[in-house]
């Protein structure tokens, strides 16, 4: 009995439905079919859980998180024992692994090995400024997603025709800051966060207006 | 034929560990469910947990979770169940078991049973 | 977590009758129901499994049936050697759990 080489890894958008293979060949007819697929979840590496199991003809649930959600990807017996869950969480991202055993058929690689990466695209990011608005000040553009992965890249534009940052500005990408310096009447304007990751993107908009100093009264 | 040896008897102070091995013999190791079942005298039989070997990992029922910790090692082929944090109420025959199959389902395969005794 | 409900907690019968042990489920098991003999000082042996399949070497007087929730061991002519303790076990819902048993005892 062989268990072939997966691909390595999976990778799926949350709330889809992930495939992760599995098949193997073999010289004995499919009479006695075992397949078992654990998953050690990425988030508690030291609780292993149990997938979902055939044995004697039968399906068993694994764990109560799989239930309703996993079945193998085929009708079985088969040499294809690939199985999809459905409705892909976050904790569902781990390294699962196909255990395989076929009586009499005995030696060679019975386990078969691949990750699961479920994806999250950022949640919408809040837009925040930090230091004073009085013309001469430093400011600081905030920008943070509570949710994303791959972690977001942020991008800051300035919503003008030119879609540039002032040139005293210095930005970011990965803490998601821009930092203006010295601030003038045209760093004044709306400016847009665009939080990314390889699956989706989201923005929010803030707007900085300079406050210049009034003039004093005699 | 598989064969199950467990551990002899074992006498412990509460609050102290215990650990049982269970060595088994004609049959592969490494891909099948060794389980571990209690029993208290006069009482019941009640699934603690598992392990195959070969994922090296195992699964608890959730009232032993963090108390008890089940681990194999593929060279010798022993299971080992180790319970901490002992009481007079964890005083019972501690058998292994072993299913046809990879998971825990039902057990065609018996260890002879040890005896742990928790008494101060 | 899965009850099993093993009624009576005690049946007395004399050899070559009938034995009807009754298991009963909190939740549905499908047909994944084993059954365990039992001797004092002994381990668990296993009788059947999927409710009805008999285990390797199992004599034909012992049988079972049932599924969903209602489960029954019948041993249809009691010999000397079967007074035990038979106790059932469900595996499709975690933790796996077995039934507090029922002493089949001489009459």
């Known amino acids: 009995l062989e268990v072939s080489e997966s691909p390595g890894s999976v990778q799926v958008a949350r709330g889809q439905t992930a495939v992760l293979p599995c098949a193997f060949s073999t010289s004995a007819a499919l009479l006695n079919l075992n397949v078992i697929w654990m998953v050690i979840p990425l988030s508690n590496a030291n609780q292993p859980e149990q997938v979902i199991l055939y044995q004697g003809g039968q399906m068993f649930d694994g764990a109560l998180r799989f239930h309703g959600r996993v079945g193998f990807t085929g009708t079985m017996p088969a040499t294809n024992v690939s199985i999809f869950i459905n409705n892909t969480q976050l904790s569902d991202t781990g390294t699962y692994q196909c255990l395989v055993n076929n009586l009499p058929d005995r030696g060679g690689r019975n386990i078969g090995v691949t990750g699961l990466t479920v994806l999250v695209p950022p949640s919408a990011p809040q837009c925040q400024i930090q230091g004073s608005q009085d013309l001469g000040s430093d400011v600081i553009l905030l920008c943070s997603s509570e949710e994303g992965i791959p972690r977001p890249t942020y991008l800051w534009e300035k919503l003008d025709n030119t879609l540039k940052l002032p040139p005293t500005a210095t930005q970011d990408q990965v803490q998601g800051t821009v930092t203006i310096r010295n601030i003038s009447a045209l760093s004044s304007g709306l400016y847009q966060c665009v939080a990314s990751n390889a699956i989706g993107t989201s923005t929010c908009l803030l707007d900085l207006q300079v406050i210049s100093p009034q003039p004093r009264s005699v | 034929q598989v064969q199950l040896v467990q551990s002899g008897a074992e006498v412990k102070k509460p609050g102290s560990s215990v650990k049982v091995s269970c060595k088994a013999s004609?049959?592969?190791?490494?891909?099948?469910?060794i389980s571990w079942v209690r029993q208290a005298p006069g009482q019941g039989l009640e699934w603690m947990g598992g392990?195959?070997?070969?994922?090296?990992?195992?699964n608890y029922a959730q009232k032993f979770q963090g108390r008890v910790t089940i681990t194999a090692d593929e060279s010798t082929s022993t299971a080992y169940m180790e319970l901490s944090s002992l009481r007079s109420e964890d005083t019972a025959v501690y058998y292994c078991?072993?299913?046809?199959?990879?998971?825990?389902?039902?057990?065609?395969?018996w260890g002879q049973g040890t005896l742990v005794t928790v008494s101060s | 977590e899965t009850t099993l409900t093993q009624s009576p907690a005690t049946l007395s019968v004399s050899p070559g009758e009938r034995a009807t042990l009754s298991c009963r489920a909190s939740?549905?098991?499908?047909?994944?129901i084993a059954w365990y003999q039992q001797k004092p000082g002994q381990a668990p042996r296993l009788l059947i499994y999927?409710?009805?399949t008999r285990a390797t070497g199992i004599p034909a007087r012992f049988s079972g049936s049932g599924s969903g929730t209602e489960f029954t061991l019948t041993i249809s002519s009691l010999q000397s050697e079967d007074f035990a303790v038979y106790s059932c076990?469900?595996?499709?819902?975690?933790?796996?759990?077995f039934g507090q048993g029922t002493k089949v005892e001489i009459k």
């Open positions: 076990q469900q595996y499709k819902n975690w933790p796996r759990t």
């Open positions: 004609g049959g592969t190791f490494s891909s099948y469910a």
């Open positions: 392990i195959i070997p070969i994922f090296g990992t195992a």
């Open positions: 999927d409710s009805s």
């Open positions: 939740q549905g098991v499908r047909s994944n």
């Open positions: 078991a072993r299913g046809r199959g990879f998971g825990e389902l039902y057990f065609d395969y």
